[in-house]
């Protein structure tokens, strides 16, 4: 039986490319400029298949000597993209993927950009900026987000099954009602995960059953009514 | 796209039996189950019972079921709903319902008069 | 059988107000749940379904939310089309029960 009777999806993908920024303007500039200082890393989750921009430092570029932007990728060599300010040049090192560039020419705007997010890109990103004050940094611990694809089926008697397709990190599924469930994960290569809830409802007045699927991405729920048990007799009159 | 189509009206006598058609268009008839529901003039909405065309098996609330019969002909993907011993408690609209109530039929009014 | 507690049962309010109902389920069931809108002579329009996801083609000024056993449906900003009775629909249990009805006026 297709999930929510007659193809009743219950979330809506959107799938414009979508663009994430830490990036602040001038005015949070400087209202926050030794907070953000301080702060050195940030822990970020970004969607998959969005584009990203990470920033460096709030430091004005005439007071710049180099920028140094740092990309630790899993199973990878560290890249590195760096402009130095008094000569105008730019430098790259082992650094291989196309989708990481500035975002403009480095001598008008220091950021770093990811189109179109991998999951490749998992990974560490830092900028430090070399001034006369000394260096300042500031490190991504970026996380990639993959919404999982969500099913829901009734395999036999008063059992359903949902499933949270490669998702990552890990899906949480729950049901209306609570049921006798089992769950299983399974760890692909890629670092997404699948998760597979199986419930069945002894309890016969349950007519329809929900799947609610939780994830950083956002949540989704599917329902379906339970299909009578084969050979069942029509309710006595 | 999915429809359900009903009469619009009935006339019956009181102690008189009357059959109340939906007729499915647009999905798998036999993988869904049909309900039925129940409205009183200027009243909420009750549910008499569901079937499930692939299988025939049916249920129903409590209270309507010495009054309401269900059946399908698979053949014209037609569910039926009869109602005996009619009173004027049983004049309503009956309306047939699919997809867990996201299709609806136009609803057939029932009159129970002399 | 689960019963279900809509209030109000008729509320009054001007073009433009935000107007919320609440469907409560008995004994603390956890079920699901979906809001119709009915208007005279016509069968019920299905507005939200699984508590909170919007139908497609209803406007996004109808909402819905659950708190536990707690569903609530909101009208954003009201418009004079949006004058019917409301029914919560819980379908999670045999047999399916509705709320009594939320009759929305426009002042």
């Known amino acids: 039986q297709p999930n929510n009777s007659l193809m009743l999806q219950t979330s809506k993908e959107n799938h414009a490319l979508a663009s994430s920024s830490l990036c602040m303007d001038e005015k949070q500039i400087t209202q926050n400029y030794s907070k953000v200082l301080a702060e050195v890393n940030t822990s970020w989750p970004v969607k998959m298949a969005t584009n990203a921009v990470l920033c460096c430092p709030p430091i004005a570029l005439r007071n710049l000597i180099i920028i140094t932007w740092e990309i630790i990728l899993r199973g990878q060599p560290s890249c590195t993209k760096a402009y130095k300010k008094e000569t105008n040049e730019t430098k790259e090192t082992n650094c291989t993927d196309e989708r990481i560039t500035w975002v403009s020419r480095p001598d008008q705007n220091s950021d770093l950009q990811i189109r179109t997010v991998a999951i490749t890109h998992d990974g560490y990103y830092r900028c430090i900026m070399v001034t006369p004050d000394g260096n300042f940094h500031r490190g991504y611990h970026l996380q990639v987000l993959v919404t999982p694809e969500v099913t829901l089926f009734q395999n036999r008697n008063r059992t359903a099954v949902c499933k949270a397709v490669a998702g990552k990190p890990a899906a949480h599924i729950s049901w209306i009602p609570e049921g006798d469930c089992a769950t299983k994960q399974e760890y692909w290569s890629n670092g997404t995960v699948t998760v597979k809830s199986t419930c069945h409802w002894e309890v016969h007045n349950v007519s329809t059953v929900t799947c609610h699927v939780s994830h950083l991405t956002g949540n989704k729920s599917l329902y379906i009514e339970l299909l009578p048990v084969p050979g069942a007799k029509k309710s006595a009159k | 796209q999915v429809q359900l189509q009903q009469p619009g009206s009935e006339l019956v006598r009181p102690g008189a039996s009357v059959k109340l058609s939906c007729k499915a268009s647009?999905?798998?008839?036999?993988?869904?189950?049909m309900h039925w529901v129940k409205q009183r003039p200027g009243q909420g909405l009750e549910w008499i019972g569901n079937?499930?065309?692939?299988?025939?098996?049916?249920n129903y609330d409590e209270k309507f079921k010495s009054k309401a019969t269900l059946t399908v002909d698979t053949s014209s993907s037609t569910a039926y709903m009869q109602i005996s011993s009619l009173t004027s408690e049983d004049s309503a609209v009956y309306y047939c319902?699919?997809?867990?109530?996201?299709?609806w039929g136009q609803g057939t009014l029932v009159t129970v008069s002399a | 059988d689960v019963q279900m507690i809509q209030s109000p049962s008729s509320l009054s309010a001007s073009l433009g107000d935000i107007v919320t109902m609440t469907c409560q389920a008995s004994?603390?069931?956890?079920?699901?749940l979906n809001w119709f809108q009915q208007k005279p002579g016509k069968a019920p329009k299905l507005l939200i379904y699984?508590?909170?996801n919007l139908e497609d083609g209803v406007p996004s000024r109808f909402s819905g939310s659950r708190y536990g056993t707690d569903f609530t449906l909101t009208v954003s900003s009201l418009e004079d089309e949006d004058m019917a009775t409301y029914f919560c629909?819980?379908?999670?249990?045999?047999?399916?029960?509705f709320g009594g009805g939320t009759k929305l006026e426009i002042k």
């Open positions: 319902t699919t997809g867990t109530s996201t299709y």
């Open positions: 079937i499930y065309p692939g299988s025939g098996t049916t």
């Open positions: 699984g508590a909170v």
């Open positions: 647009g999905y798998t008839f036999t993988s869904y189950w």
């Open positions: 629909l819980q379908h999670t249990y045999l047999p399916w029960t």
């Open positions: 004994q603390g069931t956890s079920i699901n």
